[in-house]
Interface confidence: medium
Amino acid sequence: IFLSAFFTYVPMNEQIIIGRLGEDIILPSSFERGSEVVIHWKYQDSYNSYNVHSYYKGSGRLESQDTRYANRTSLFYNEIQNGNASLFFRRLSLLDEGIYTCYVGTAIQAITNKVVLKVGVFLTPMMKYEKRNTNSFLICNVLSVYPRPIITWKMDNTPISENNMQETGSLGPFSINSTLNITGSNSSYECTIENSLLKQTWTGRWTMKDGLHKMQSEHVSLSCELVNDYFSPNQDFKVTWSRMESGISSILAYYLSSSQNTTFYESRFSWNKELKNQSDFSMNLTDLSLSDSGEYLCNISSDEYTLLTIHTVHVEPSQETASDN
């Protein structure tokens, strides 16, 4: 009987791999090249193990593959002889989370690698400003997130806790609304949503500017600047100017940084400056009329940030109009 000196015994290695819901992932596994390669990928839960993908005698063996992995897994068959036993995994679902073991046997060694797969999702959140009757609300909303995120609010850079949370999706992914009543406040607010698994953070910032009092037929300049602290130079973003009226928002202008295209929905609206440096998105509204009074909202949004700037414009009758009456 031979001594085991011909064999290499490798302890079980463990790796954590993070994937995104609906996307593809590679579960890594490598081994020392040898003849007669056998590969068994298995999924282990508390009660059972399930065959994910097997390879032996020169080809993939899927007869005993669990149905949940059908048409979703493959090996890099051309690279097996070079020691690559990695598993290509398609269309991740949250149910795929868990422990995977890759058994690799060759004529010179047998090893078991352990891969812990975690699946996350973080659809870009948004910050909305809503008026309901006489009340004003800020809503931070994320349509699809997993695992549960950490949501924090700040008022004038001071953390606050009084917010109303609504969550749907019992097992995930979750849809979450966090609402803050800001009626009568002139403070600035910030909402941060953090997905610790995906190491992704989104921040929404709301600022109310001082009220602007203008006379009829004058023009008004509404400031809105991109703060460099928030946006990196190569990041795509969009700018939307809208007007809030009776709780309904109507779009006045729209700008996309990727195409550098602007669409105006109001002929009296124009940029204050040329958008050469793409940081100042202040607007001019000309030929003001009494009906232009109201709240104007500038929304600058990227995957990581939303900056909301609110202007309240009061348009008063001009002297001539007043004396004519």
Epitope: Y9, H40, S49, S54, K57, Y103, G105
Partner: antibody, heavy 120, light 107 residues
Framework: QVQLVESGGGVVQPGRSLRLSCAAS????????MHWVRQVPGKGLEWVAV????????DYADSVKGRFTISRDNSKNTLYLQMNSLRVEDTAVYYC?????????????WGQGTLVTVSS | DIQMTQSPSSLSASVGDRVTITCRAS??????LAWYQQKPGKVPKLLIY???TLQSGVPSRFSGSGSGTDFTLTISSLQPEDVATYYC?????????FGPGTKVDIK
């Protein structure tokens, strides 16, 4: 050094049961498929059963199917063969053997064997 | 089930002779064939797998060839310590049948 030590053999009457054990050491037991192979003294080798490294797959020779059950306890580094409804023709030396690779069914290490005698 | 046959069932040869043992499968088994050596009173020992791959530590005078249904084990120069019974085994699918064996001794 790879060591496989069988136990549990003995004399038993036809129709009765016996359980063989095989204690493994000197290698990572949970990484390898394991076999039982038997040999009537002075005769050839007969493959009996195999179990995968994690116990998830098992195969048997037609001559023992439905009567013998192969199992393993990886926490104890032990392989078992439960033999029910024993017949006179089951008399043999039973070897516990280790796969060279799990899923490629040939053997690179053998135990010394344990003799099972089925006789009335 | 696939049957395995070996020929001859026994042979005697002189030290230094070239010895050839044949193993035949009743159906094709690709190269999924192993050869074992069992010396008197000892347990079997793996010599060759995948029809022609020499197991670690096995002397180079042993070699294997063949594919499909016909396979051979060759001892290029028979040595006294090679006195044994040699078995082939197919391992493409269960049952993993052994051949009946070929007994080799010295003249």
């Amino acid at each position: 050094q790879v060591q496989l030590v069988e136990s549990g053999g003995g004399v038993v009457q036809p129709g009765r049961s016996l359980r063989l054990s095989c204690a493994a050491s000197g290698f990572t037991f949970s990484n390898y498929g394991m076999h039982w192979v038997r040999q009537v003294p002075g005769k050839g080798l007969e493959w009996v059963a195999v179990i995968w490294y994690d116990g998830s797959e098992k195969d048997y020779a037609d001559s023992v199917k439905g009567r013998f059950t192969i199992s393993r306890d990886n926490s104890k580094n032990t392989l078992y063969l439960q033999m029910n409804s024993l017949r006179v023709e089951d008399t043999a030396v039973y070897y516990c053997a280790k796969d060279l690779i799990s899923g490629i069914y040939y053997v690179d290490h053998w135990g010394q064997g344990t003799l099972v005698t089925v006789s009335s | 089930d696939i049957q395995m046959t070996q020929s001859p069932s026994s042979l005697s040869a002189s030290v230094g002779d070239r010895v050839t043992i044949t193993c035949r499968a009743s159906q094709g088994i690709s190269n999924y064939l192993a050869w074992y050596q069992q010396k008197p009173g000892k347990v079997p020992k793996l010599l060759i797998y995948a029809a022609s791959t020499l197991q670690s530590g096995v002397p180079s005078r042993f070699s294997g060839s063949g594919s499909g249904t016909d396979f051979t084990l060759t001892i290029s120069s028979l040595q006294p310590e090679d006195v044994a019974t040699y078995y082939c085994q197919k391992y493409n699918s269960a049952p993993f049948t052994f051949g009946p064996g070929t007994k080799v001794d010295i003249k």
